[in-house]
Interface confidence: low
């Protein structure tokens, strides 16, 4: 049956998929609040532009009877069920916001006509790359890969004088949705990251990771993992670590490192944290007051999805163009719009660009400090601290190949029991 779009005659509707399975376990009420806050802003912006139109959102809930795992495991079918619900209602908005799970987005993209845009807070996996009508408002795995390759190759900074070509990747299969797809991309033999590295091994057991920390026969000094400090501590504890080990902790959606009173714990001294540059504080907004940092990013992506739609609607209406055309569906890319927290840039494929920040722990102040930033839009690294107070010898990052630099030694101090 033909689905009509409620998207003309001065009335424009946004279809928001409220899926029980999502990339982050966020109460749907909080996402509704984010969407509603976005709608208020969009209405104000359109009114200021002299456009007297109505913009609303329809929240489409899945039944939650079959697909109720709460994470992304059973999301493929849930997405299709919601599409079926839209089809049965024969009613669709101008744009589809959600889903956030890679599986469901991929499947929904395959099973939908390309006549309307899809905006996702998530869909991190490589399988959602280069989709003509899909926009992703949280950093996808491709962006992470490009940073890592860029950083590995860098050898002309005062604190990094070696190019790296090797890595271990710790991936035990219990990661959060974002981490799962980030590490999946690094693991994939066909990915850019794998192509650019000479050696890469995935560590799947806690013991494998723990053994590498002091293994004199290790093939790389660099270990990539994904999660927060708590995750690392429970894995690494207070174990001794060879002095040329560098752990890259990918923790993009966590702005707690930038809070004033945060002291970096001892176990973080061998760690470089990759996170996103924090935006302006969202704590005063009604939708985010009670959200954790990760969830602020997730809710913010929903809100920014609404603002993006408003931005495109305004442009098309001012130009007298039809909203229900493939041109509109394909337009949500290669642009910058005013997001809730500042300008948001989308690349040629509709993926959000951002400033990634690499942090280190200062041995002097025990604070997290910015080592460098990386602009995903131009694929360029900008050093910030030219004289970092590293734990590593000579305040330089070591070579990635064991045996070419100083080696650690001594006994292991286990967190739990000696």
């Amino acid at each position: 049956s033909q689905v009509s779009q409620n998207c003309h005659n001065g009335s424009y509707e946004i279809s928001v998929l409220m899926m029980g399975n999502s990339a982050f376990a966020e109460p749907l009420k909080n996402l509704e609040d984010a969407v509603n806050e976005g709608l208020e802003i969009v209405r104000g912006r359109l009114q200021n532009a002299g456009l007297n139109v109505t913009v609303n959102a329809t929240f489409m809930y899945s039944d939650g009877l079959i697909h109720n795992s709460g994470d992304c495991r059973s999301s493929t079918c849930e997405g299709l069920d919601l599409l079926r619900k839209i089809s049965n209602a024969q009613r669709m908005g101008c744009v589809l916001i959600g889903p956030s799970c890679t599986y469901s987005t991929f499947q929904m993209y395959l099973d939908t006509e390309l006549s309307y845009p899809m905006i996702s807070a998530g869909s991190f996996g490589l399988s959602c790359d280069y989709k003509e009508t899909l926009t992703r408002l949280m950093s996808p795995a491709r962006k992470l890969m490009y940073f890592l390759v860029n950083f590995w190759k860098t050898n002309d900074l005062p604190f990094k004088t070696y190019s790296w070509s090797t890595s271990y990747v710790y991936k035990n299969g219990t990661e959060t949705e974002d981490c799962f797809w980030y590490l999946n991309a690094l693991e994939a033999s066909v990915s850019y990251f794998s192509h650019e590295l000479g050696f890469k091994v995935v560590l799947r057991q806690d013991k494998e990771f723990q053994d590498i920390l002091m293994d004199h026969n290790r093939k790389s000094n660099v270990i990539i993992m994904c999660g927060g400090p708590e995750f690392l501590y429970k894995l690494k504890g207070d174990r001794a670590v060879a002095e040329d080990i560098v752990i890259i902790l990918v923790d993009l959606f966590n702005d707690q490192y930038f809070e004033d009173n945060v002291t970096a714990p001892d176990y973080m001294k061998n760690v470089l944290v990759l996170t996103l540059s924090p935006g302006n504080s969202l704590l005063n907004s009604s939708f985010s007051r009670n959200l954790s940092p990760t969830k602020r990013d997730f809710a913010l992506a929903y809100l920014n999805g609404i603002l993006l739609f408003g931005h495109m609607l305004k442009i098309f209406l001012e130009n007298g163009e039809n909203i229900t055309t493939p041109k509109f569906a394909h337009a949500f890319r290669n642009l910058t719009f005013e997001g809730y927290d500042g300008p948001v840039t989308l690349d040629d494929w509709g993926d959000v660009d951002s400033t990634m920040v690499l942090l280190y722990t200062s041995v002097d102040t025990k604070k997290y400090k910015v080592l460098l930033t990386y602009d995903t839009h131009v694929n360029k690294t900008y050093p910030v601290d030219m004289s970092p107070t590293f734990t590593w010898k000579n305040s330089k990052l070591p070579n990635d190949i064991t045996g070419r630099g100083p080696q650690g030694g001594g006994g292991s101090e286990n967190l739990y029991f000696q």
Epitope: A25, N172, T174, T176, D206, P229, E230, F231, Y233, K234, L235, D238, Q256, Y257, E259, N261, V262, T263, A264, P265, D266, S292, K366, L415, Y416, F417
Partner: antibody
Framework: EVQLVESGGGLVQPGGSLRLSCAAS????????MHWVRQAPGKGLEWIGE????????NVHEKFKDRFTISVDKAKNSAYLQMNSLRAEDTAVYYC???????????????WGQGTLVTVSS | DIQLTQSPSSLSASVGDRVTITCRAS??????????MQWYQQKPGKAPKLLIY???KLASGVPSRFSGSGSGTDFTLTISSLQPEDFATYYC????????FGQGTKLEIK
């Protein structure tokens, strides 16, 4: 309301087994570490072990490793303590508690269940 | 394990008294500028209740007459002016390496 409720205690013979449950409500279960702590009659508190619901990581004190296993059912927001080869000295009130790690790395047991009594006797 | 020794094991005091309980760890529980030491209150037949975390930080909802101090291996819980509801057993706990508790201090009415 944040709440932990233990169940499954009772009288068991030496050498027997028992499975204790801890039902969590009022908070995001997967964001915590869930712990089991016991207290023998008239004695102090003794930590048994912990589990991270979202990842299934467990750490059990060496003293209990061979006999006690900790597990979770995320769908039910519940943690479990499986106790095998029980001895008279395992007679105690068993508490379920949680930790939430702060950015600064503090760990503390901020919420406790009411406890469930396990009596091992013939 | 890190061993914790509380003193005294028991203590008699009156309402309005200032009371101090100490806890000594077998090794330092300091961790990058923080001391991972907690204090709990337990009444008969009830679960323990968190009073102090990170040596000196007052847990939510705990009266300000309770305070904690110390660093490294030596820690103190102080009740500035005893109230009738404060008579209970108090435990220290470290979370520096795994989790261990002191043997407890029973605070009784004189």
């Amino acid at each position: 309301e944040v709440q932990l409720v233990e169940s499954g205690g009772g009288l068991v013979q030496p050498g027997g087994s028992l499975r204790l449950s801890c039902a969590a409500s009022g908070f995001t279960f997967s964001h915590t570490w869930m712990h089991w702590v016991r207290q023998a009659p008239g004695k102090g508190l003794e930590w048994i072990g912990e589990i991270k619901p979202s990842r299934g990581f467990t750490n059990v004190h060496e003293k209990f490793k061979d006999r006690f296993t900790i597990s979770v059912d995320k769908a039910k927001n519940s943690a479990y303590l499986q106790m095998n080869s029980l001895r008279a000295e395992d007679t105690a009130v068993y508490y379920c508690t949680r930790t939430i790690t702060t950015t600064q790395g503090y760990w503390f047991f901020d919420v406790w269940g009411q406890g469930t009594l396990v009596t091992v006797s013939s | 394990d890190i061993q914790l020794t509380q003193s005294p094991s028991s203590l008699s005091a009156s309402v309005g008294d200032r009371v101090t309980i100490t806890c000594r760890a077998s090794e330092s529980v300091n961790w990058y500028g923080s001391s991972l030491m907690q204090w709990y209150q337990q009444k008969p037949g009830k679960a323990p209740k968190l009073l102090i975390y990170a040596a000196s930080k007052l847990a939510s909802g705990v009266p300000s007459r309770f305070s904690g101090s110390g660093s490294g291996t030596d820690f103190t819980l102080t009740i500035s002016s005893l109230q009738p509801e404060d008579f209970a057993t108090y435990y220290c706990q470290q979370t520096r390496k795994a989790y261990t508790f002191g043997q407890g201090t029973k605070l009784e009415i004189k």
